[in-house]
Interface confidence: low
Amino acid sequence: TLNSVLNSNAIKNLPPPLGGAAGHPGSAVSAAPGILYPGGNKYQTIDNYQPYPCAEDEECGTDEYCASPTRGGDAGVQICLACRKRRKRCMRHAMCCPGNYCKNGICVSSDQNHFRGEIEETITESFGNDHSTLDGYSRRTTLSSKMYHTKGQEGSVCLRSSDCASGLCCARHFWSKICKPVLKEGQVCTKHRRKGSHGLEIFQRCYCGEGLSCRIQKDHHQASNSSRLHTCQRH
């Protein structure tokens, strides 16, 4: 459950698109060993972030919504959670990522093929704000139409970094993997744990861009091990 992963480290207000894409925990899942695979970040793990409390969706980033992190949780304890991708379960439009809306309990694309000018009424059926997916839907989405021919743009579903356009990498986002921007100087990054260790891989960040490495921020040297902040810095 979420309770086991909320008590870890760092920050909320990340520069877009990291806020939300990598900023908040989801359900606890097993993860691959924390080593960086050359040319991609398949094995990248992530330090979890402190949840950002909220009362309504507007207080969260554009790629987030406000909800209780646990199924049937106390509505008074709400945090910003990463938005739900296409074909994921939803209760209201705000839960779905930009470019999608909530239809019949599922986030669907609001492009011309799916969205004909009307916003459908949000369903009233109570799903509970858990992060399980409908019908036990897989952590990686099944093969969907954006994946394979043109290089994926930011937010496109992918299987590996070579599926993504230049400047993007393929990283896990909830139970899918999507193309996310390679990190720039000063952006928060994940310091990879030693080989063989395990961590949560729900929201992967990309690796640092060329000429950059993920290092502890100088003014955070006095912080405890669990709360040190790493950023992409020049070699």
């Epitope: 691959a32 074909r87 019908d135 839907y137 897989s138 990686r140 099944t142 969907s144 139409s145 394979y148």
Partner: antibody, heavy 116, light 107 residues
Framework: QVQLVESGGGVVQPGRSLRLSCAAS????????MHWVRQAPGKGLEWVAI????????YYADPVKGRFTISRDNSKNTLYLQMNSLRAEDTAVYYC?????????WGQGTLVTVSS | YVLTQPPSVSVAPGQTARITCGGN??????VHWYQQKPGQAPVLVVY???DRPSEIPERFSGSNSGNTATLTISRVEAGDEADYYC???????????FGGGTRLTVL
């Protein structure tokens, strides 16, 4: 519970056609990409085709490309495989499957025998 | 894309069986493993390299790096005797690919 039930198999002569069906229940069929996988007697698994959840895209294994057509009717929760110009080497048990990682379900298969 | 498995692996009860699946840079792909017993449909035992469906015993585990993915079955039991297949999605050809299968024999 999730169920996938294939039907339509049987004995057919080379060059003839056959249509397989897969009736799905216990899950929201229209939200899942679906596959056909086959297994010749005593041989390994061979992927045949995929159709996306909404029917928008279809891909086929090279040995069946141009002869087999995968389709679906989401209103009937049914997956189809139209097999034309059948060959002896198409003889196999044909499975429909979700192949969706954690949500991975297979039918029990239907036997297609191509023989003169 | 080709996945190569050994045709057979033999192991004594209680020992550890390791079934390999070789493929060019397979470490960059998500690998899934199936168990198939005679006359039955395949059953998923490991997905996304190392994740296990809830109904599968913890004795089944997977790893994947470089050019080899491995299914490991610890404390092998007679009931584990079956054919095992690895599977990936090859994005360059838009195909699902299965390995040739490995027959696990429990001595």
């Amino acid at each position: 519970q999730v169920q996938l039930v294939e039907s339509g198999g049987g004995v057919v002569q080379p060059g003839r056609s056959l249509r397989l069906s897969c009736a799905a229940s216990g899950f929201t069929f229209s939200r899942y990409d679906m596959h056909w996988v086959r297994q010749a007697p005593g041989k390994g698994l061979e992927w045949v085709a995929i159709i996306f959840y909404d029917g928008s895209n279809k891909y086929y294994a090279d040995p069946v490309k141009g002869r087999f057509t995968i389709s679906r009717d989401n209103s009937k929760n049914t997956l189809y495989l139209q097999m034309n110009s059948l060959r002896a080497e198409d003889t196999a048990v044909y499975y429909c499957a979700t192949l969706a990682a954690a949500f991975d379900y297979w039918g029990q298969g239907t036997l297609v025998t191509v023989s003169s | 894309y080709v996945l190569t498995q050994p045709p057979s692996v033999s192991v004594a009860p209680g020992q550890t069986a390791r079934i390999t699946c070789g493929g060019n840079n397979i470490g960059s792909k998500s690998v899934h493993w199936y168990q198939q017993k005679p006359g039955q449909a395949p059953v998923l035992v490991v997905y996304d390299d190392s994740d296990r469906p809830s109904e599968i015993p913890e004795r089944f585990s997977g790893s994947n790096s470089g050019n080899t993915a491995t299914l490991t079955i610890s404390r092998v039991e007679a009931g584990d005797e079956a054919d095992y297949y690895c599977q990936v999605w090859d994005s360059s050809s838009d195909h699902v690919v299965f390995g040739g299968g490995t027959r696990l024999t429990v001595l």
